[in-house]
């Protein structure tokens, strides 16, 4: 905490420009109006300020706003945006997505911290649900944003959202949230034809029942090896050998490559040798 | 050991078919799918299309679809490609190759188109 | 269909040297389940068939000189000839497996002074 001193003759700000650059710590506290600085949060950005510097600036941000910052002053926080805490921004509230893109932007290129993860959670709370535009932006910043949330919480995204996930999105995605995802990605592309519909759901697909698989392969989808073993174990096992062979197409032929990993191994152990025969892989049952 | 074995030279006529072979010794032959493989000077190789030896299942790359046909003879081990309507294009060495990783290349089959 | 670019295009070493040429696909060749990258390289001889090298990207196939190492995941790949001999002369391919159709990268030509 800076004690409160009297601002040195001459020395008061009367806009937040480089010169302060040159302000010891106390100066800063004494010298620098609050509402001033709220007012022009964009220029703190552009002046190479100390970190302990941003320390006192953050202290006068907080003495006069001790309810939590109002989102003009949020949207322009730049690298002060580092400073604050989880608990500092409980406080605030988020509706604008620039303001969302202008924080995030400040963090790119490093891990999720504690700061952005508060920060994503009060802007989809305060919006209700975690819409199109939300997505395709956190995404954006995070691929692996999706499947960080719980399938509780990934409950709340609308099908039409789905539209906004890539396939990298879900890469880290365990099956318990690709069973939650699947139905709405299911939803989404409903009316799509046959071949589009695939492209867009082949990535949910680690969530897809025995029965979608068995209409899948009625259509000539030629899914590959690594589609086929993200699928879930219990959808794979009541499929046919004949069934297998026309949901993979020609990439039924990796199913030897592959024939020591799940699911494949335990699928090949359900079907009669003489079924594993046509597939010409010397597969043994 | 492994061979796939493939006659060396095919000279034809632009608008006429050729059928290809390649017997395979040395292995069982419907254990392993085959491919074929299309190599033209300077060009690199293209991948035709695969059969599955045991039930004669086949998958073209679309651009060969209406040029090549691929079926088997189980009873002696060889595989056979018939490429149709032949032009000067269609002028490359083809090889037939086994398996998943080509692990076993045939000798290779110059197709020379040429009135 | 996925692209593959090799690099370069040709080579010109010294017997005893090391040779690093490159192989990238336009898609991650990498499934994740199996940890595997759906990629092999050839080496084709002058006027000889193609003969594998290394599949899933790293696995030498058996009677391959150790010099040969394959490494690379996902969509950037290499092969790596330790010490060139002069029997190591030819056109270089990688190719994909991980989708139909198969497709082969343009080759690398080493030369061996």
């Known amino acids: 905490e800076v004690e409160k001193t009297a601002c040195p003759s001459g020395k008061k700000a009367p806009e937040i420009d480089e010169s302060l650059i040159f302000y010891k710590k106390w100066e800063l506290e004494a010298c620098v109006d609050a509402a001033l600085l709220a007012t022009q949060m964009d220029r703190v950005n552009a002046i190479p300020f100390t970190y302990e510097q941003l320390d006192v600036l953050k202290h006068k941000l907080d003495e006069l706003y001790p309810q939590g910052y109002p989102e003009s002053v949020i949207q322009h926080l730049g690298y002060l945006f580092l400073k604050m805490s989880p608990e500092d921004i409980r406080k605030w509230n988020v509706t604008s997505l620039e303001t969302l893109k202008a924080l995030l932007e400040v963090n790119k290129g490093h891990e999720m911290s504690p700061q952005v993860a508060t920060l994503i959670d009060r802007f989809v709370k305060g919006r209700g649900q975690l819409d199109k535009d939300t997505l395709d932006t956190l995404t954006a910043f995070y691929p692996g944003y999706l499947c960080s949330l719980s399938p509780e919480e990934l409950s709340s995204v609308p099908p039409s959202s789905i539209w906004a996930v890539r396939p990298q999105d879900l890469d880290t995605c365990d099956p318990r949230q690709l069973d939650v995802l699947y139905p709405k990605a299911r939803l989404a592309f409903q009316n799509m034809n046959g071949s589009e519909y695939f492209v867009k759901i082949q990535s949910f697909l680690g969530g897809a029942p025995t029965e979608d698989l068995k209409a899948l392969s009625q259509q000539n989808v030629s899914m590959d090896l690594a589609t086929f073993m993200k699928l879930r174990t219990d959808a794979v096992l009541p499929l046919t050998v004949a069934e297998v062979q026309k949901l993979l197409g020609p990439h039924v032929e990796g199913l030897k490559a592959e024939e020591r990993h799940r699911p494949v191994r335990d699928w090949i152990l359900r079907q009669r040798q003489d079924d594993l025969d046509t597939l010409g892989l010397g597969l043994q049952g | 050991q492994v061979q796939l074995q493939q006659p060396g030279t095919e000279l034809v006529k632009p608008g006429a078919s050729v059928k290809l072979s390649c017997k395979a010794s040395d292995y069982t032959f419907t254990s392993y799918w085959m491919h074929w493989v299309k190599q033209r000077p300077g060009q690199g190789l293209e991948w035709i299309g695969s059969i599955n030896p045991s039930n004669g299942d086949t998958y073209y790359n679309e651009k060969f679809k209406n040029k090549a046909t691929l079926t088997v003879d189980k009873s002696s081990s060889t595989a056979y490609m018939q490429l149709s309507s032949l032009t000067s294009d269609d002028s490359a060495v083809y090889y037939c190759?086994?398996?998943?990783?080509?692990?076993?290349w045939g000798t290779g089959t110059t197709v020379t188109v040429s009135s | 269909d996925i692209v593959m670019t090799q690099s370069p295009s040709s080579l010109t070493v010294s017997v005893g040297q090391k040779v690093t040429m490159s192989c990238k696909s336009s898609q991650s060749l990498l499934n994740s389940s199996s940890q595997k990258n759906y990629l092999a390289w050839y080496q084709q001889k002058p006027g000889q068939s193609p003969k594998l090298l290394v599949y899933f990207a790293s696995t030498r196939e058996s009677g391959v000189p150790d010099r040969f190492i394959g490494s690379g995941s996902g969509t950037d790949f290499t092969l790596i000839i330790s010490s060139v001999q002069a029997e190591d002369l030819a056109d270089y391919f990688c190719?994909?497996?991980?989708?139909?159709?198969?497709?082969f990268g343009g080759g690398t030509k080493l030369e061996i002074i």
């Open positions: 190759a086994r398996g998943w990783y080509f692990d076993v």
């Open positions: 190719q994909q497996h991980y989708s139909t159709p198969r497709t």
